[in-house]
């Protein structure tokens, strides 16, 4: 029965970008400017998102898809579909309730967003610190102290720094 009814429903013929206009004998009318319908058979068009203030337009609203927003320079997107814009900080900083603060000693942030993370503990992998960490960079771990003893072969190159994880958006 449902399938039969949908086949007879004139609104089911209205494609995306239109709405089924009850005021015009269920004719398919184009979505007016600043509105869209992303699926067929809709009885109304949705209002387009406006990218205002700290948001800027990434992609205009078309008749079939909503506008896509981005953040103005100095801010970055957070949340699904860039629902929020968060202030950028410098590398070596993290955003707190009181604004951008330098990373504490022993932590680093190599991005303009996210939190400060602890330096890699080289000794956990049985290695030594080859290059000291900074607020902006993780430490670089090198060969273990035993590998550096006299007579030991030093053909093996130092292991690369562990890839820092990306903070969630």
């Amino acid at each position: 029965f449902e399938r039969t009814r949908s086949l007879q429903d004139p609104c089911s013929n209205c494609p995306a970008g239109t709405f089924c206009d009850n005021n015009r004998n269920q004719i398919c009318s184009p979505c007016p400017p600043n509105s869209f319908s992303s699926a067929g058979g809709q009885r109304t068009c949705d209002i387009c998102r406006q990218c205002k203030g700290v948001f800027r337009t990434r992609k205009e609203c078309s008749s079939t898809s909503n506008a896509e927003c981005d953040c103005t320079p100095g801010f970055h997107c957070l949340g699904a579909g860039c629902s929020m814009c968060e202030q950028d900080c410098k590398q070596g900083q993290e955003l707190t309730k009181k604004g951008c603060k330098d990373c504490c000693f022993g932590t680093f942030n190599d991005q303009k967003r996210g939190i400060c993370r602890p330096w890699t503990n080289c000794s956990l992998d049985g290695k030594s610190v080859l290059v000291n960490g900074t607020k902006e960079r993780d430490v670089v771990c090198g060969p273990s102290p035993a590998d550096l003893s006299p007579g030991a072969s030093s053909v093996t190159p130092p292991a690369p720094a562990r890839e820092p994880g990306h903070s969630p958006q």
């Epitope: 184009p30 400017p33 869209f36 800027r56 337009t57 992609k59 205009e60 078309s62 079939t64 898809s65």
Partner: antibody, heavy 113, light 112 residues
Framework: VEESGGRLVTPGTPLTLTCTVS????????MIWVRQAPGEGLEYIGF?????FTYYASWAKGRFIISRTSTTVDLKMTSLTVADTATYFC????????????WGPGTLVTVSS | DVVMTQTPASVSEPVGGAVTIKCQAS??????LAWYQQKPGQPPKLLIY???TLASGVSSRFKGSGSGTEFTLTISDLECADAATYYC??????????????FGGGTEVVVK
Amino acid sequence: VEESGGRLVTPGTPLTLTCTVSGFTINSYHMIWVRQAPGEGLEYIGFINDGGFTYYASWAKGRFIISRTSTTVDLKMTSLTVADTATYFCARGVDGTSYPDLWGPGTLVTVSS
Amino acid sequence: DVVMTQTPASVSEPVGGAVTIKCQASQSIGSDLAWYQQKPGQPPKLLIYRASTLASGVSSRFKGSGSGTEFTLTISDLECADAATYYCQCIYYGSDDVIYHTFGGGTEVVVK
């Protein structure tokens, strides 16, 4: 809206066209470039939107670059050929879209050896 | 690419008559279609966008309709000033920063 910079150039010569506007703020609108070869139809090149993002027709991507200041929009063209001979129009988009509604008179670019 | 096929290429009608121009898209574009009028030596003029929305200052004698792949521009009560070439144009986004904002081939309207 007024275009400038069109002239006679030889193939391969780079050229930059400038669109100067008054009476409205460029960064509140989509600003569009369209061209028309002599006696031919209209061809959409691309636009820079109100957010500063650029979009190009597939044939124009890589060879044309659109940029803007607060009062001008530039169209940088490279590797020009005889087929690029056309009147180049700059236009403002209507109602937050990339449909051109306010057009300049156009500037003629002739590519010939 | 989205191809816009515009018909007829040319049409001639008397003053007071009506003209219908059709535009067919190679794939569904919702209602993202505009119509322009261009006279020799002039830039185009936007008549209709979003398939049926009349642009500012345009006479209500111009009517746009259609959705999906089939669109129509109707000019009623023709005037001598309507003699021009008319173009349809779609708005369609491809991947990345590529667009298919394609124009139709144009229709020359002659008013007798």
